[in-house]
């Protein structure tokens, strides 16, 4: 386990953005259900531009933007760039 | 344990090519969101952050030096170099490798180097 | 380029004052903003992130805050093994931007 400066927080994100993300940007979705000692969902984006962020899992768009992406990676074979899981 | 060890030249002469090299360990820039980078500070003065290399070779350079420096990676090797062409006096600093990962909280530059102190003197 | 306006540049202040550093963002950069120390001949440390998270190891005199576009960096109550150099960073957008430092010196 590699020592981190930051501190283990039971949640990992200490603040959300409501703004949209455009699809054409984000590189992975990852969706954390409560869970772990964090009691509240949990999004993270990772976008193309080697950035980081959490995102308001409440957010309209964000809602829209994973129907879109969810019902592409049924219909298609290749890796779906969400992924849901819990915290390690 | 993560450490980052820098070498290059002590000295060189303006119009010269500094190549630095940054030696790793305690982790790897095979896996997704591993990034390692170059910030440097001329003795006495501020940071600046000059250029990223990711796991997926993407880069990112600072725009005030982006025609003069390069940056590249040796990942079976755990190294990272970085060149700067036509060196003058103002280049003199001491060079820090640092490492960044795209986790949550994501706090780049979260391990840094000794440093390397670099002259350029005619 | 975000530009970040730190200060002051220097600072001497005695054991057990209250120290505040600040830094200023030319554009909203959203507490992407971390803060180093730098002790003399040593290379710097994350001492907090997102604006007001305290790193690991931190003491707790340590503190971050935010206003608008304004981020400041306090010590509640200054210990000597608290000199150094301090620095923001932001990382909203590339290329980062760093403070011009902030050196604390012993009043």
């Known amino acids: 386990i590699l020592e981190a400066h930051y501190t283990n927080l039971k949640c990992r994100c200490s603040g959300v953005i409501s703004t949209v993300v455009g699809l054409n940007i984000i590189d992975r979705i990852q969706v954390t259900p409560p869970g772990n000692g964090c009691p509240k969902t949990e999004v993270v984006i990772w976008t193309k531009m080697k950035k980081v962020i959490c995102v308001n899992p409440r957010a309209k768009w964000l809602q829209r933007l994973l129907r879109h992406v969810q019902s592409k990676s049924l219909s298609s074979t290749p890796q779906a760039p969400v992924s849901k899981r819990r915290a390690a | 344990q993560v450490t980052l060890k820098e070498s290059g030249p002590e000295i060189l002469q303006p119009s010269q090519t500094l190549t630095l090299t940054c030696t790793f360990s305690?982790?790897?820039?095979?896996?997704?969101?591993?990034?390692v980078g170059w910030i440097r500070q001329p003795s006495g003065k501020g940071l600046e952050w000059l250029a990223n290399?990711?796991?997926?070779?993407?880069?990112y350079y600072n725009p005030s030096l982006i025609n003069r420096l390069t940056i590249s990676k040796d990942t079976s090797n755990n190294q990272a170099f970085l060149k700067i062409t036509n060196v003058d006096t103002t280049d003199s600093a001491t060079y820090y490798c640092v490492r960044s990962e795209l986790v949550m909280p994501y706090v780049p530059f979260d391990y840094w180097g000794q440093g390397v102190m670099v002259t350029v003197s005619s | 380029d975000i530009q970040m306006t730190q200060s002051p540049s220097s600072m001497s202040a005695s054991l057990g004052d209250r120290v505040t550093i600040t830094c200023q963002a030319s554009?909203?950069?959203?507490?992407?903003l971390i803060w180093f120390q730098q002790k003399p001949g040593k290379s710097p440390r994350p001492l907090i992130y997102y604006a007001t998270n305290l790193a690991n190891g931190v003491p707790s005199r340590f503190s971050g805050r935010r206003s608008e576009s304004n981020y400041a960096l306090t010590i509640s109550s200054l210990e000597s093994e608290d000199m150094a150099d301090y620095h923001c960073?932001?990382?909203?957008?590339?290329?980062?931007?760093f403070g011009a430092g902030t050196k604390l010196e012993l009043k």
């Open positions: 960073l932001q990382f909203k957008q590339y290329p980062y931007t």
């Open positions: 305690g982790f790897s820039l095979s896996p997704y969101g591993m990034g």
């Open positions: 290399i990711w796991w997926d070779d993407d880069k």
């Open positions: 554009q909203d950069i959203e507490n992407d």
